[in-house]
């Protein structure tokens, strides 16, 4: 099939005191090969500080996956979710505390 770029959605949720969990979800993409990782100051976090979901079919002939990490509240500006798919890339910030959903479709 033809390339379908992912929808990328970053959310945040309360973790332990002083920390938040940030999750980056990529959905509705094809083919299934994708790079999704959290960066701090533009540098990829080590694998042991991130949790990845499997790349799974979403039932529409496309795929979905996610990556999450825990960060200190107040340091959100240092972190971005980086996505690479089919030769295209994008960077996605952590939403501010009063805005929990950012959706971006990349072409």
């Amino acid at each position: 099939g033809s390339t379908v770029p992912p929808m990328v959605n970053v959310t945040r949720s309360e973790a332990s005191e002083g920390n938040i969990t940030v999750t980056c979800r990529a959905s509705s993409f094809y083919p299934r090969n994708i790079i999704l990782t959290w960066r701090q100051d533009g540098v990829s976090l080590s694998h042991d500080t991130q949790q990845w979901g499997d790349v799974l079919p979403d039932g529409n002939g496309t795929y979905q996956t996610w990556v999450a990490t825990r960060i200190c509240r107040g340091e959100e500006q240092r972190f971005t979710c980086y996505m690479e798919h089919s030769g295209n890339h994008s960077t996605h910030p952590v939403p501010s505390g009063n805005s929990h959903h950012h959706h971006h479709h990349h072409h």
Epitope: Q40, V43, Q77, T80
Partner: antibody, heavy 118, light 108 residues
Framework: EIQLVQSGAEVKKPGASVKVSCKPS????????IYWVRQAPGQGLEWIGY????????IYNQQFKDRATLTVDKSTSTAYLELSSLRSEDTAVYYC???????????WGQGTLVTVSS | EIVLTQSPATLSLSPGERATLSCSAS???????LHWYQQKPGQAPRLLIY???NLASGIPARFSGSGSGTDFTLTISSLEPEDFAVYYC?????????FGQGTKVEIK
């Protein structure tokens, strides 16, 4: 081959401003942050700030927040550092660098000497 | 601000000798955030070791890094003539990003 090419040396009067450019090549410009670092003659390295060219986010070292301005021109894949209200202590070599996959500074420009003298 | 203190300031050694450079941090740093750079006169720094102990691309195996917490070490097992330079440690764990003041490795 990844390269970062900077603009040439500058001589400025105290109180003036300077704008240094950095043109990376060999990779997708918006995929990595551009950092700026300076080095006074015979001294160590001092981080000024960085910019994410994709979303335009800028993080400054608080020490430079009032005088440094980081920008990018995505149409020409060029990053800029402008430093205002120059004083003699700003005489230094200014470097741009690219954020790496596993370290903050993986490739560097050749440096731009800025001399501030009356 | 995390202050990185490098010692010694200058190391005078002969080719073939072992060089041990220290970097001490004012606060604990995860090993993922400690990097080393080499700078020769008139040149830009270049990445030598990332994340405490990993050799950057093209860096010979005589270079090695170790450490944890507040104390980190760069070792050059047998100095080659091209290794005489200034070495900087750098931390990326907290802002502002900071460098050590450098250790100059000079020919004895």
């Amino acid at each position: 081959e990844i390269q970062l090419v900077q603009s040439g040396a500058e001589v400025k009067k105290p109180g003036a401003s300077v704008k240094v450019s950095c043109k990376p090549s060999g990779y997708a410009f918006t995929s990595n942050n551009i950092y700026w670092v300076r080095q006074a003659p015979g001294q160590g390295l001092e981080w000024i700030g960085y910019i994410d060219p994709y979303i335009g986010r800028i993080i400054y070292n608080q020490q430079f927040k009032d005088r440094a301005t980081l920008t990018v021109d995505k149409s020409t894949s060029t990053a800029y550092l402008e430093l205002s209200s120059l004083r003699s202590e700003d005489t230094a070599v200014y470097y741009c660098s690219r954020s790496g996959e596993r370290s903050n500074f993986d490739y560097w420009g050749q440096g731009t000497l800025v001399t501030v003298s009356s | 601000e995390i202050v990185l203190t490098q010692s010694p300031a200058t190391l005078s050694l002969s080719p073939g000798e072992r060089a041990t450079l220290s970097c001490s941090a004012s606060s604990s740093i995860s090993s993922n955030y400690l990097h080393w750079y080499q700078q020769k006169p008139g040149q830009a720094p270049r990445l030598l070791i990332y994340r405490t102990s990993n050799l950057a691309s093209g860096i010979p195996a005589r270079f090695s890094g170790s450490g944890s917490g507040t104390d980190f070490t760069l070792t050059i097992s047998s100095l080659e003539p091209e290794d005489f330079a200034v070495y900087y440690c750098q931390q990326g764990g907290s802002l502002p990003l900071t460098f050590g003041q450098g250790t100059k490795v000079e020919i004895k």
